[in-house]
């Protein structure tokens, strides 16, 4: 019968021959009267044979990554009968890996979105890098991810690519971070090979700001002649969130004359002093109101950011008329 | 690293002008607004101005207006403080700061997060 | 002109907690930041809009802000807290600091 042994060739061997293994009978006695003879796919192009030994050489530069393994048919002949010795048979040549390949990114540009002051471990994303190496194959595609731009924001798991936040952020300091993430194989260890990728982290806003006015005092007029339902003047606040997040309701906080009143307009997110009853000049020519500004919606775990509205003072001086 | 380095500063008469200048680096200097801030010997911070990113807007302290003028030149990374008929007062550190928030936030709700080492200018006859 | 005022001075055992207060008509519907300043060093931002924690600052450091008072707080206090603290607002777009609090960490 055939005596086998499992046959092994390192991909990219740079030598012009490498010796592979060898074809033996147990009937071979070693006085060559048997021819041995190597078929299939390979069989003369990358490898050859010592038709008097048996023995296996590979004469090509193999890539693991693009052929592991080589089926080949094996037979020895007796020289002096011209028969076979033993059945044609088949056998496998498996070419080794080598560390050859680095991890690479397949799934770029990786771009994720996670809200503003979210807490640490707050899951971001995962990046998930391949090795064309061989994983069965000692650590050549173990891979390691590190982080190499981003602290002291997030942080990378360094088995699973999963990225998380280390630190609180906050969108209105900065509305979006890159970070850079390296995966290495050989678990990290001399002699790794590694590759990088890019990941684009935006946040996304929360309502963490309250609207302020930005002046703490406003001086209106208003004409004695004018009606009820007047819009004497307009007030301001801002609010650096975005979205319904900067939506914002103005109110009368204090009126003791009830005399005005203040709408908000939607649209430019301003207030409207209205007059609410009409005035005169001679029974009062000036008015002092506080209005205040709230935002319209508002969470409940977020309300440590609202504790207290802004308000702001507004004079009004009533404008004499001549009357007949 | 994100750093701001002040110049210019030095000794001068009372009534006559000076200008500091705030080299940035480090950062994208066109998108935050930055402020000087002053500190005279053995006393407490006193905000001077500010200019916004794009030097839309420009505000003093009422101890200034008129006097100073806050610049900058986005193209050099470069902030400065034209400071005109100078008191003795006026003597102090000078500090660069940069406005905390992302352009198209307004106010100074998020304090000034990086200063510069200071320059001091000294009005003396 | 708007004004805040702080104590001048407050002192604080090790390992204690030091508060210092910053007050200012209607304070608490503004925000406030609160700064700390070693001798000859430019000062450095502890604590914005009330309550955050800009990146790298220890959460011993807190603040809270409500009605006239905003106060920043200290907790377990140590030997390198020993330094000059400002509060800082904004009143119709010009800033304003306190006068400043020196805090003694008492050996």
């Known amino acids: 019968g055939w005596v086998w042994n499992q046959f092994f060739v390192p991909e990219e061997m740079n030598t012009t021959s490498h010796h592979v293994g060898r074809l033996r009978s147990d009937l071979d006695n070693g006085n060559n009267s048997f021819q041995y003879k190597l078929l299939g796919a390979g069989a003369g192009s990358t490898f050859i044979i010592d038709e008097r030994t048996g023995d296996i050489y590979a004469i090509e530069k193999l890539d693991r990554e693009e052929r592991s393994l080589y089926i080949l048919r094996a037979q020895v002949i007796d020289i002096t009968t011209g028969r076979a010795v033993e059945p044609e048979s088949e056998f496998v040549i498996k070419v080794s890996d080598i560390n050859d390949n680095e991890p690479k990114f397949l799934d770029e540009p990786y771009e994720a979105i996670v809200p503003e002051m979210s807490p640490e471990g707050t899951l971001v994303i995962q990046v998930t890098a391949s090795d064309a190496d061989d994983p069965s194959s000692g650590n050549n595609a173990r891979l390691l991810y590190s982080l190499l731009q981003g602290q002291p924001y997030f942080s990378v798991e360094p088995t699973t690519g999963v990225i998380r936040i280390s630190s609180k952020m906050d969108r209105e300091l900065q509305d979006e971070y890159w970070v850079i993430i390296q995966a290495k194989d050989m678990i990290g260890q001399p002699g790794a090979l590694s590759g990088t990728t890019s990941v684009l982290i935006k946040l996304s806003d929360v309502n963490d700001n309250k609207p302020i006015f930005k002046e703490s005092l406003y001086r209106l007029t208003v004409s004695e002649s004018a009606p009820t339902g007047t819009s004497i003047g307009t007030i301001m606040a801002y609010d650096n969130d975005i979205g319904e997040n900067a939506e914002m309701d103005y109110s009368i906080e204090e009126d003791d004359s009830q005399t005005f009143d203040i709408i908000t307009n939607h649209e430019t997110q301003e207030g409207i002093v209205i007059l609410k009853k009409k005035v005169n000049f001679e029974h009062q020519n000036h008015y002092g109101i506080r209005a205040k500004v709230k935002n319209h919606h508002v969470d409940e775990q977020l309300m440590k950011y609202h504790t207290e509205a802004s308000t702001t003072f507004i004079k009004i001086q009533v404008e004499d008329v001549d009357e007949p | 690293q994100v750093q701001l380095v002040e110049s210019g500063g030095g000794v001068v008469q009372p009534g006559r002008s000076l200008r500091l200048s705030c080299a940035a680096s480090g950062f994208t200097f066109s998108r935050y607004g930055i402020h000087w801030v002053r500190q005279a010997p053995g006393k407490g911070l006193e905000w001077v101005a500010v200019i916004w990113y794009d030097g839309s807007n420009k505000y003093y302290a009422d101890s200034v207006k008129g006097r100073f003028t806050i610049s900058r030149d986005n193209s050099k990374n470069t902030l400065y403080l034209q400071m005109n008929s100078l008191r003795a007062e006026d003597s102090a550190v000078y500090y660069c700061?940069?406005?905390?928030?992302?352009?198209?936030?307004?106010?100074?709700?998020?304090?000034?997060?990086?200063w510069g080492q200071g320059t001091t200018v000294t009005v003396s006859s | 002109s708007y004004e805040l005022t702080q104590p001048p001075s407050v002192s604080v055992s090790p390992g204690q907690t030091a508060s210092i207060t910053c007050s200012g008509d209607?304070?608490?519907?503004?925000?406030v930041s609160w700064y700390q300043q070693k001798p000859g060093q430019s000062p450095i931002l502890v604590i914005y809009q009330d309550n955050k924690w800009p990146s790298g600052i220890p959460e011993r450091f807190s603040g809270s802000n409500s009605g006239n008072t905003a106060t920043l707080t200290i907790s377990g206090t140590q030997a390198m807290d020993e330094a000059d603290y400002y509060c800082?607002?904004?009143?119709?777009?010009?800033?304003?600091f306190g006068g400043g609090t020196k805090l003694t960490v008492l050996s």
């Open positions: 800082q607002a904004w009143d119709s777009s010009t800033v304003v």
């Open positions: 209607r304070l608490g519907e503004k925000y």
């Open positions: 700061a940069r406005r905390a928030g992302i352009p198209g936030t307004t106010g100074y709700y998020y304090g000034m997060d990086v």
